[in-house]
């Protein structure tokens, strides 16, 4: 015998209290698959979360973060504060990238500048807190008399930015 509930489409539930009739999901609830015996409560985007997509009878609401924050985790389960470019978020808040490192985003950690010499290249543009170095041609490729920017000093251990 076929389960009568299997005929209930997404957006409905199989109502045991009404002889297993397919009933629409109540307000603020949804079922994303057929044959459900209950509907799930819609996610509410509250506090620092804002609604990116409204809940419907067949799909849950989706949240993102208010400006100044970005999503972390599956389905934006957490909002993390943004920093400025050239900074990283530490346990003590946003701190400038230390010398020899950079961050070109409002999130994530400061990463060491590219070491151009490892690829046999010279530094064309020095790095900053916000931007990586730009590597140029190898010193041997430069025409006689041409000079390149001095390669950066080795990066200090990350995580110790000057106060």
């Amino acid at each position: 015998l076929q389960d009568p509930c299997s005929n209930c489409p997404a957006g409905t539930f199989c109502d045991n209290n009404r002889n297993q009739i397919c009933s629409p999901c109540p307000p603020n609830s949804f079922s994303s698959a057929g044959g459900q015996r209950t509907c799930d409560i819609c996610r509410q985007c509250k506090g620092v979360f804002r609604t990116r997509k409204e809940c419907s009878s067949t799909s849950n609401a989706e949240c993102d973060c208010t400006p100044g924050f970005h999503c972390l985790g599956a389905g934006c389960s957490m909002c993390e504060q943004d920093c400025k470019q050239g900074q990283e978020l530490t346990k003590k808040g946003c701190k400038d990238c230390c010398f020899g490192t950079f961050n070109d985003q409002k999130r994530g950690i400061c990463r060491p500048w590219t070491n151009c010499s490892l690829d046999g290249k010279s530094v064309l543009v020095n790095g900053t807190k916000e931007r990586d170095v730009v590597c140029g041609p190898s010193p041997a490729d430069l025409s006689p008399g041409a000079s390149s920017v001095t390669p950066p000093a080795p990066a200090r251990e990350p995580g110790h930015s000057p106060q």
């Epitope: 996610r43 506090g47 972390l72 389960s77 909002c79 504060q81 003590k92 808040g93």
Partner: nanobody, 122 residues
């Protein structure tokens, strides 16, 4: 019942001061960082300030730095936001929140107050 309640809002002239309070009931505020947010009509909710639970380190948005001061009195289970040199653009509903982790991470399980209206106008 776990609850956060803001108070102290009102109408104030530009250049004036207000002190907002965020009182907790049903849990110990001293165990939590407390963040302050505000939302002006038709605008997104904006982070204003936060005070850590561990060492009472304070953090401020650039827009309020030097004018607002956050402090806490764990014995009274209350956090305060002292707002000086108020400007018309500070007009908003002010909310306090108790994130589960720290000043910089907020989840859907955090405690939030209902808000208190601050209006700066002459």
């Amino acid at each position: 019942q776990v609850q956060l309640q803001e108070s102290g809002g009102g109408l104030v002239q530009p250049g004036g001061s207000l002190r907002l309070s965020c009182a907790a009931s049903g849990f110990s505020l001293g165990l939590y960082a407390i963040g302050w947010f505000r939302q002006a009509p038709g605008k997104e909710r904006e982070w204003v300030s936060c005070i850590m639970s561990s060492d009472s380190s304070a953090y401020y948005a650039d827009s309020v730095k030097g004018r607002f001061t956050v402090s806490r009195d764990n014995a009274k289970n209350t956090v305060y936001l002292q707002m000086n040199r108020l400007k018309p653009e500070d007009t908003a509903v002010y909310y306090c929140a108790a994130p589960q982790s720290d000043c910089f991470h907020y989840s859907e399980n955090d405690y939030w107050g209902q808000g208190t209206q601050v209006t700066v106008s002459s």
